[in-house]
């Protein structure tokens, strides 16, 4: 079974089939009789309930809200409600690039080292039963491959393999033809040696805060693709609903390494958030590097030398 849509922010391209699947699906089957509702809100409109009568493009199946296809005016916030369970998504529908076979903003980047194993597999598990055929394109030129259900490339990488690979799935629904495109930007690089990952900035940071306010603790590192950056705080990170780990931002450096940044957001700061360690760790198989943040009440700033503060 296809997993639920747990990401709260989603970007999709206009004109393609798309679906949202809520994350209490197994629960929904147990209580068939419970009222289940989908809502949309955008700009001026507050919570409008969705049903197949709202639009001929919308279909509802058990746990799923389907768009056939999704269009620009579908941008907005979507809610699923069942008893005391609510799930929310923010959907951003972007314009299709009419001059290309793919849309730049919806590209997945992959780096492959020369002579290492290189694979492209075209698959789409959710729409699998509806797919008539699938084509694989390189830089928008169709590749002639034997399997037209799940085209695949498996080989040792060469520099000429670099490019944009687009899997285009063609499917029929209610007598109409649709396609779904997934594009990979494949960069072929020389054999790269690993760096020792390092966190940027001081190892101990005292942050001046006010009770009831919010603070964002930013942790940045230089690392390899396979290294990981994470926050550690409290009892296995699960105890404080006011603490949120934001999504990691990664930018590739000219040397083929990564600059990563991960923010810990603490909302409505309370006494329990003061004078405790919030640790950010970058880990590789070669070891770890950790930096610590301590929240200190602004009134207590005078007790700590100025040079240890981050603003």
């Amino acid at each position: 079974a296809e997993s639920c849509t747990s990401r709260p922010h989603i970007t999709v391209v206009e004109g393609e089939p798309f679906y949202l699947k809520h994350c209490s699906c197994s629960l929904a089957h147990e209580i068939e009789t419970t009222t289940k509702s989908w809502y949309k809100s955008s700009g001026s409109q507050e919570h409008v309930e969705l049903n197949p009568r709202s639009s001929s493009r919308i279909a509802l199946h058990d746990c799923v809200l389907e768009f056939w296809p999704v269009e620009l005016n579908d941008t907005g916030s979507y809610f699923f409600q069942m008893k005391n369970y609510t799930q929310k998504w923010k959907l951003n529908v972007i314009r299709r690039n009419k001059h290309s076979c793919f849309t730049e903003r919806q590209v997945t980047s992959k780096i492959v080292e020369v002579k290492k194993f290189f694979q492209i597999t075209c698959e789409n598990s959710y729409y699998q039963t509806l797919v008539n055929s699938t084509s694989l394109y390189k830089n928008c030129k169709k590749l002639l491959l034997e399997n037209n259900k799940n085209p695949t490339i498996k080989k040792n990488a060469e520099f000429e393999d670099q490019g944009y690979y687009s899997c285009v799935h063609f499917l029929h629904h209610n007598g109409k033809l649709f396609n779904i495109t997934k594009t990979f930007n494949i960069t072929i690089v020389e054999d790269r040696s690993n760096i020792v990952p390092v966190l940027l900035g001081p190892k101990l940071n005292h942050v001046a805060v006010e009770l009831g306010k919010n603070v964002r603790l930013n942790c940045s590192a230089l690392l390899n693709e396979e290294d990981v950056i994470y926050w550690m705080f409290g009892e296995e990170n699960g105890s404080d609903p006011n603490i949120h780990e934001e999504k990691e931002m990664r930018i590739m450096t000219p040397e083929g390494k990564w600059h990563a940044s991960k923010v810990l957001r603490i909302e409505n700061i309370g006494e329990s958030n003061l004078n405790v360690l919030y640790n950010c760790t970058v880990a590789s198989t070669g070891g770890t590097d950790t930096k610590s943040f301590i929240l200190v009440r602004k009134a207590d700033m005078a007790d700590i030398p100025g040079h240890v503060f981050t603003r």
Epitope: T11, D227, V228, K247
Partner: nanobody, 119 residues
Framework: DVPLQESGGGSVQPGGSLRLSCAAS????????MRWHRQAPGKQRELVAT???????NYADSVKGRFTISTDNAKNTIYLQMNSLNPEDTAVYRC?????????????WGQGTQVTVSS
């Protein structure tokens, strides 16, 4: 979204072997980095093995030559074969993957599976 489920943990005698599995709920082809971590009580979490989509594999010195990370794309599963186990390998083992989605880097974690090595 890539929920992960580990299995294969358990108790084993020193010198024994175990194979941990980490099943992803969707294709692991789109995953850029696959990792196995471990954490023993009172110790810092340790990254023991990594596998990237570009074909690079790394191991922590403490497990080199004994542990092997591998994948099975058809089964959407990541494995950690652990041989010549010793008591210092006792820990909770968690798999973790990193991938690009909507231009953002996402890390997903499994719940973990307990490995105990004792005579």
């Amino acid at each position: 979204d890539v929920p992960l489920q580990e299995s294969g943990g358990g108790s084993v005698q020193p010198g024994g072997s175990l194979r941990l599995s980490c099943a992803a709920s969707k294709s692991i082809f789109s995953i850029n980095a696959m990792r196995w971590h471990r954490q023993a009580p009172g110790k810092q979490r340790e990254l023991v093995a990594t596998f990237t989509s570009s074909g690079r594999i790394n191991y922590a010195d403490s497990v080199k030559g004994r542990f092997t990370i591998s994948t099975d794309n058809a089964k959407n599963t990541i494995y950690l074969q652990m041989n010549s186990l010793n008591p210092e390998d006792t820990a909770v083992y968690r798999c973790n993957v990193g991938l690009w989605e909507d231009g953002l880097w996402y890390d997903y974690w499994g719940q973990g599976t307990q490995v105990t090595v004792s005579s």
